[in-house]
């Protein structure tokens, strides 16, 4: 499974999307964990609704949060005040009791705010901009190694 | 109508291999997940295995595998279970089924295949 | 494996009697279970889907109960059609697991 990589500046938002094929998930919970290590366990940070046809409610732990629109496939992972910390390697899962099936790998990269650094040259983020999309390769601090999410092998 | 038509009857001599088919119709057959049940002469219902024909990710229980082997050809809309070779014991009704979807989630085996009896003798 | 266990193994009852069947499961497993009615010769049949609903088509004197580790399936007011053999299976966890099924004869 290929890694997304997806850089967010400290302090805002990052938003995470995987999609999968809504037929073959059908009734199942998503999750959101951060791996400890390359080969280590994945610690769950949040999952979704415990009841499957309330996925679609935002379910938070701590500054994450996590919806899954169930009809479209794509699961939604909204990382807020996004820290240096928060920088690591994470999995959405798709969970069928005891067993999670790993949908995404992403690898989340903290930014300094380059008004914090006076090295920063002229990395340029719009005002607005208060959130980071995944796939969002307008803006030059999000990229993708992979850029397409394929459906989960 | 949805409906899942299995292959005929077959008898075999131990040592043999055989394939044996579950086609759907009646529905969008690579979207829903297809297993595979067992049940020996006189005896209960025995979960073999499940594909996913629109990727072909396939779970076995434990007991099954590597005694069988589960695929599907979803451009012909067919699941197959097959033996490399056949023991005696393999001597069963082999049943396919669908797992459903319903609004609340996943609805169990909503539609099932009549059965295809499995004789393998010398 | 989680392991699905069925009782009574059998039991005899007469047209129009109540009838109760229990699965119990080793681990939680949700409300992913169904039960199945299958006649000799015949393929099962699902008559209960997500622990307590009822199929289209399935009368409604058949009824499933319970979450957790303890399921019930009820047939209010047994018919002639209903001798048969009942299971249970869970589809929570691979491997799905039956229980050893429950043969309702007549008495």
């Known amino acids: 499974l290929n890694t997304t990589v997806l850089q967010g500046m400290a302090g805002q938002s990052l938003r995470v999307s995987c999609t999968y094929d809504a037929l073959k998930h059908w009734g199942r919970r998503k999750a959101w964990c951060r791996q400890l290590g390359e080969e280590g366990p994945c610690q769950r940070v949040v999952s979704t609704h415990g009841v499957w046809l309330l996925a679609f409610l935002k379910k938070r732990n701590g500054s994450t949060v996590i919806a899954d629109d169930t009809l479209a496939g794509t699961v939604t992972i909204t990382l807020k005040n996004l820290q240096a910390g928060d920088a690591g390697l994470y999995q959405c899962q798709s969970l069928r009791g005891r067993e999670a099936e790993v949908l995404q790998k992403v690898l989340v990269e903290v930014l300094e705010d380059p008004l914090d650094d006076q090295d920063a040259g002229d990395l340029w983020v719009p005002e607005e901009s208060s959130s980071f999309e995944g796939a969002q390769v307008e803006h030059s601090t999000s990229r993708n190694q992979e850029t397409s999410f394929p459906p989960t092998s | 109508e949805v409906q899942l038509v299995q292959s005929g009857a077959e008898v075999k001599k131990p040592g043999e291999s055989l394939k044996i088919s579950c086609k759907g119709s009646?529905?969008?057959?690579?979207?829903?997940?297809i297993a595979w049940v067992r049940q020996m002469p006189g005896k209960g219902l025995e979960w073999m295995g499940i594909?996913?024909?629109?990727?072909?990710?396939?779970r076995y229980s434990p007991s099954f595998q590597g005694q069988v082997t589960i695929s599907a050809d979803k451009s012909i809309s067919t699941a197959f279970l097959k033996w490399s070779s056949l023991k005696a014991s393999d001597t069963a009704m082999y049943f396919c089924?669908?797992?459903?979807?319903?609004?609340?989630?996943?609805?169990?085996?909503?539609?099932w295949g009549q059965g295809t009896t499995v004789t393998v003798s010398s | 494996d989680i392991q699905m266990t069925q009782s009574p193994s059998s039991l005899s009852a007469s047209v129009g009697d109540r009838v109760t069947i229990t699965c119990r499961a080793s681990?939680?497993?949700?409300?992913?279970l169904g039960w199945y009615q299958q006649k000799p010769g015949n393929a099962p049949k699902r008559l209960i889907y997500?622990?307590?609903s009822l199929p289209s088509g399935v009368p409604s004197r058949f009824s499933g109960s319970g979450s957790g580790p303890e399921f019930t399936l009820t047939i209010s007011s047994l018919q002639p059609e209903d001798f048969a053999t009942y299971y249970c299976?869970?589809?929570?966890?691979?491997?799905?697991?039956f229980g050893q099924g429950t043969k309702v004869e007549i008495t």
């Open positions: 089924a669908r797992q459903g979807i319903e609004v609340t989630g996943t609805g169990g085996l909503d539609v």
């Open positions: 009646g529905y969008s057959f690579p979207s829903y997940w």
């Open positions: 594909i996913y024909p629109g990727d072909s990710d396939t």
């Open positions: 681990q939680g497993i949700r409300n992913d």
């Open positions: 997500a622990a307590s």
């Open positions: 299976l869970q589809h929570n966890s691979y491997p799905w697991t």
